[in-house]
């Protein structure tokens, strides 16, 4: 007789989740020599330990501490790129500008990127059927708490000039409820971070507005200034050209505004 199982509103654990995490871990440690010492089996055990047999609405940052410890990684603190609602372009950028890092360029971010996971209280099983939705079910679910934890640590580590890529096509270019707005902004350390520089990415080809004057950007500037961190903002009118110029900065067309 099948056991009764809690039905959540969100999609279930990503298929082949354990094998995917292990494979990603192995690949990452092969590509990044400074992480060669990492034992991926231990990483998986710690990851699993954070949510297996626990109620998926009762996960805490503390649950992820063993994983955080195993995934400890030093990235150049002045080369951090945050992003909000524009992940693909941010990742394309760091793939070209290899000395800059998004959270997903770190081991823990790379492991979990685009994956969903949850368990069930009092059983050792992974729930492939459904997982809690942040809005409809609960915010203290395994995925949300993971990203809150790693995002906080990533922001805390940042120094000097921190860059953030924002999506200029959205109604709220800066969204206080995003991970960037609710976690990262508040965990930048004013004693280490001098400036937050926002890159507002334009969507439309003919869009020549100065989106740095958007009310939500002004709101971001106000929050940052109150935290004794300087704020600057740049419009990226042509993201395709922007990427091309990062690849080939010598190109003659790259001297004009992008």
């Amino acid at each position: 007789v099948p056991r009764w199982r809690q039905q959540w509103s969100g999609p279930g654990t990503t298929k082949r989740f354990p094998e995917t995490v292990l494979a990603r871990c192995v690949k990452y440690t092969e590509i990044h020599p400074e992480m060669r010492h990492v034992d991926c089996q231990s990483v998986w055990d710690a990851f699993k330990g954070a949510f297996i047999s626990k109620h998926p609405c009762n996960i805490t940052e503390e649950d992820y501490q063993p994983l955080m410890k195993l995934g400890t990684q030093t990235v150049p603190c002045n080369k951090i790129l945050l992003w909000s609602r524009i992940k693909d372009l941010a990742h394309q950028f760091t793939q070209v500008q290899r000395d800059m890092f998004t959270l997903e360029d770190t081991l823990l971010g790379y492991l979990a990127d685009d994956l969903t996971w949850c368990g069930e209280f009092n059983t050792s099983k992974i729930n492939y059927q459904s997982c809690p939705d942040w809005r409809k079910d609960c915010s203290n679910n395994p995925v949300s708490v993971f990203w809150k934890t790693v995002s906080r640590r990533f922001a805390e580590a940042a120094c000097d000039v921190v860059h953030v890529m924002l999506n200029g096509s959205r109604s709220k270019i800066f969204d206080k409820n995003s991970t960037f707005g609710s976690v990262e902004v508040h965990n930048l350390q004013p004693e280490k971070v001098q400036t937050l520089e926002a890159w507002v990415i334009h969507g439309g080809r003919e869009d020549s507005r100065d989106l740095c004057q958007d009310p939500t950007i002004k709101e971001l500037e106000s929050i940052i200034s109150k935290r004794n961190i300087q704020f600057s903002c740049k419009n990226i009118y042509r993201p395709d050209k922007f990427l091309q110029c990062v690849k080939n900065p010598e190109d003659s067309s790259c001297t004009s505004e992008i």
Epitope: P2, G12, K15, R16, P18, E19, L22, A23, V26, K27, C40, Q41, W44, S124, K125, I126, Y128, Q129
Partner: antibody
Framework: EVQLLESGGGLVQPGGSLRLSCAAS????????MSWVRQAPGKGLEWVSE?????????YYADSVKGRFIISRDNSKNTLYLQMNSLRAEDTAVYYC?????????????WGQGTTVTVSS | QSVLTQPPSASGTPGQRVTISCSGS????????VSWYQQLPGTAPKLLIY???HRPSGVPDRFSGSKSGTSASLAISGLQSEDEADYYC???????????FGGGTKLTVL
């Protein structure tokens, strides 16, 4: 002792059906992803199908058997199944079940002895 | 036709070192975990190498695995007559959404 034991093979006519079973013992069966692999006479290994651990909700099939074979598991009986329908001559092979071990990064660390399926008129 | 390409045969004399290659792509070897299997005549396959380069207990250290980019290889040093068998590489393939075995390499000890 950790063991897998296949059964259910035999001679069947083209278009016919057969159900293979794989009885597991010596380990917690529902903790493991399980797989079927076959080997045609004188040929190499060919992966056939795979089922996820616990409730077996995730199932995968090789293109050559998709729509004809169904993998399932009964954790209460510690048994893996392969229901084979619309059998063809090219399905003739020794069929092995195998366990995928997470501790060995999903290598197939335990195999059954195999059961022979012959499709012929 | 397998998405993982192995040489159909390899040979060596006792004591020699032989290497068997397994060539794939980003959708399989490039992004996934490689294992190697040994199949002695008339027997079920046996796990020889997992995670590209790890040996299960009981497998002699004469067997070693490696991976580089989208290729993997199995090396057998100090070849012995009992190593005469078929060898298969295997991994998950993201494009097929299934597992894949190489075509197999028949190793002959001369």
């Amino acid at each position: 002792e950790v063991q897998l034991l296949e059964s259910g093979g035999g001679l069947v006519q083209p278009g016919g059906s057969l159900r293979l079973s794989c009885a597991a013992s010596g380990f917690t069966f529902d903790d493991y992803v399980m797989s079927w692999v076959r080997q045609a006479p004188g040929k190499g290994l060919e992966w056939v199908s795979e089922i996820s651990e616990s409730d077996g909700s995730n199932k995968y099939y090789a293109d050559s058997v998709k729509g004809r074979f169904i993998i399932s598991r009964d954790n209460s009986k510690n048994t893996l199944y392969l229901q084979m329908n619309s059998l063809r001559a090219e399905d003739t092979a020794v069929y092995y079940c195998a366990r995928l071990e997470p501790e060995k990064y999903y290598g197939m660390d335990v195999w059954g002895q195999g059961t022979t399926v012959t499709v012929s008129s | 036709q397998s998405v993982l390409t192995q040489p159909p045969s390899a040979s060596g004399t006792p004591g020699q070192r032989v290497t068997i290659s397994c060539s794939g792509s980003n959708s399989n070897i490039g992004n996934n975990l490689v294992s190697w299997y040994q199949q002695l005549p008339g027997t079920a396959p046996k796990l020889l190498i997992y995670r590209h380069d790890h040996r299960p207990s009981g497998v002699p250290d004469r067997f070693s695995g490696s991976k580089s980019g989208t290729s993997a290889s199995l090396a057998i040093s100090g070849l012995q007559s009992e190593d005469e068998a078929d060898y298969y590489c295997a991994t998950w393939d993201d494009s097929l959404n299934g597992r894949a075995f190489g075509g197999g390499t028949k190793l002959t000890v001369l």
